[in-house]
């Protein structure tokens, strides 16, 4: 006869491991008992359990409540046992010793591999600001046994670097994603992808990129100077910029206070019916936590009466 077992039994942390040991004997042969022991090199063999053909399973103190026989129906030639709730410390070599009649004793070894699935964590880097050089966007760390694989999934252009730390029964892998921040990256997803044989599917953690920037400011509303004449209603100036975080707007007049009746509504400066008093230099001040910008424009309100008077003067002067 001979023993049938597996070279390697693989289970995920917390699962039950079936340690197989089946005696394939000739007819009439009987199994008297099967002794299971931990057989790691460097340690004395540590008994797990003894499975007796007549008297069932007797478990060692160290494995009390954790070693069981597989559920019925049971073959009298099957010396397999179940190791409940596998932990990392269970990983190693196991030996089954089978006493048979009349063929004598047989033994076989197997290796139990306990997969420890990783629990990845993603840590964003320092605040990203446009104009910085190569900067850490995020790092992703996953520890497991065996070592997990950590990669990145993103449309953003960048570079990755990985390092691994080996512990006694596991390994921690950290991958960093570096990029040169630009405003086009704002709102883009950066996803850490962790692969491991103990996971049914890859684990993904997504980080949304935030790049601080502030665009140059400009003022719209003066495209047609002829529209800025005395008496015109609904005249307005709009300050244009964009940024992250979204900027705030402030309007001032360089050559004095804002005329009465002029309304500030965020990025917009609204005028009452125009008078020549509204002529002047207006400044839009745009700012966010990252930076500030200014844009100034000169408003020249035309007075048709003044113009015609000047023409008369000119005529008379000629």
């Amino acid at each position: 006869g001979e023993l049938e077992t597996s070279d390697v039994v693989t289970v995920v942390l917390g699962q039950d491991a079936k340690l197989p040991c089946f005696y394939r004997g000739d007819s009439g042969e009987q199994v008297g008992q099967v002794a299971w022991a931990r057989a790691d090199a460097g340690e004395g063999a540590q008994e797990l359990a003894l499975l007796h053909s007549k008297y069932g399973l007797h478990v060692s103190p160290a494995y009390e409540g954790r070693v069981e026989q597989p559920p019925p129906p049971r073959n009298p030639l099957d010396g397999s046992v179940l190791l409940r709730n596998a932990v990392q410390a269970d990983e190693g070599e196991y030996e089954c010793r089978v006493s048979t009649f009349p063929a004598g004793s047989f033994q076989a070894r197997l290796r139990l591999r306990v997969l420890v699935p990783p629990l990845p964590s993603l840590n964003p880097g320092p605040a990203l600001e446009e104009g910085q050089g190569l900067t850490l966007a995020a790092s992703c760390t996953a520890e497991g046994s065996p070592a997990p694989s950590v990669t990145w999934d993103t449309e953003v252009k960048g570079t990755t670097s990985s390092r691994s730390f080996k512990h006694s029964r596991s390994a921690a892998v950290t991958s960093e994603f570096h990029l040169v921040p630009s405003r086009s990256m704002n709102g883009q997803p950066l996803t850490c992808v962790v692969s491991h044989p103990g996971l049914l599917q890859d684990q993904r953690i997504t980080h949304i990129l935030h790049v601080s920037f502030l665009a140059e400011a400009s003022v719209r509303g003066l495209e047609d100077q002829n529209l800025w004449h005395v008496g015109r209603e609904g005249a307005m100036l709009k300050c244009l910029s964009e940024g992250q975080p979204p900027p705030s707007y402030n309007w001032t007049r360089l050559d004095g206070p804002l005329p009465s009746g002029v309304r500030v509504d965020g990025d917009t400066l609204g005028f009452p019916p125009l008078t020549t008093e509204h002529s002047g230099i207006y400044v839009c001040h745009v700012s966010n936590e990252f930076s500030s910008r200014d844009s100034q424009v000169t408003v020249d309100v035309l007075d048709p009466q003044e113009d015609s008077g000047k023409q008369v003067d000119l005529v008379s002067a000629s």
Epitope: A35, G44, Q46, E47, H58, V59, S60, P61, A62, E64
Partner: antibody
Framework: QVQLVQSGAEVKKPGASVKVSCKAS????????IHWVRQAPGQGLEWMGI????????SSAQKFQGRVTMTRDTSTSTVYMELSSLRSEDTAVYYC???????????????WGQGTLVTVSS | QSVLTQPPSVSEAPRQRVTISCSGS????????VNWYQQLPGKAPKLLIY???LLPSGVSDRFSGSKSGTSASLAISGLQSEDEADYYC???????????FGGGTKLTVLG
């Protein structure tokens, strides 16, 4: 060699407690259960209880429940049995015994301590 | 009153064969292994037979064990004076969840 060495004889008054020690050597202490068995003068053997030396979990005969406490100290490979509320009929030789046979996990006692005589007398 | 029943004493002449019986129930002998212990005067018990019929190393093959149903027996052949001792049978009891012993049998080697 494998052996269990017990503490010396004790004389106690009724109502008192006694604590007997059993020091194991020559084998992996945490790998085998330890049992306590007593024998009154001229009487037979009586099983008292069992202790798991790695977890400290115990189980005792119904007769002794509430009176017997079994503990262990893995750092010194020593098991203790304390019997409280002693009465004259507790006068006996108390033995500790290792379960297993020649390293195999069998329900039999292959190694016994030399015994500790506990005399309960007023 | 012991859970397992043994004769209080047996005697036989040297070089003869003697048998000691041990009777129990389905919760102990019927379902579990029987062990036999020898206790010489003033000494701790010594394992003689385990798992019904197996001999630990160092025990003379003059000793043998057997079991049938809820009874077990210990046989000693070629009796010698040093075999004079108390003999105890023991088994785990599923109902009591503990070991049970017989009351012991005193063997006297005559002559």
């Amino acid at each position: 060699q494998v052996q269990l060495v017990q503490s010396g004889a004790e004389v106690k008054k009724p109502g008192a407690s006694v604590k007997v020690s059993c020091k194991a050597s020559g084998y992996t202490f945490t790998s085998y259960y330890i049992h306590w068995v007593r024998q009154a003068p001229g009487q037979g053997l009586e099983w008292m209880g069992i202790i798991n030396p790695i977890s400290g979990r115990t189980s005792s005969a119904q007769k002794f429940q509430g009176r017997v406490t079994m503990t262990r100290d893995t750092s010194t490979s020593t098991v203790y049995m304390e019997l409280s509320s002693l009465r004259s009929e507790d006068t006996a030789v108390y033995y500790c015994a290792k379960e297993g046979v020649g390293g195999e996990l069998l329900r039999a006692f292959d190694i016994w301590g030399q015994g500790t005589l506990v005399t309960v007398s007023s | 009153q012991s859970v397992l029943t043994q004769p209080p004493s047996v005697s036989e002449a040297p070089r003869q064969r003697v048998t000691i019986s041990c009777s129990g129930s389905s919760s102990n002998i019927g379902n579990n292994a029987v062990n036999w212990y020898q206790q010489l005067p003033g000494k701790a018990p010594k394992l003689l037979i385990y798992y019904d019929d197996l001999l630990p190393s160092g025990v003379s093959d003059r000793f043998s064990g057997s079991k049938s149903g809820t009874s077990a027996s210990l046989a000693i052949s070629g009796l010698q004076s040093e075999d004079e001792a108390d003999y105890y049978c023991a088994a785990w009891d599923d109902s009591l969840n503990g070991f049970v012993f017989g009351g012991g049998t005193k063997l006297t080697v005559l002559g």
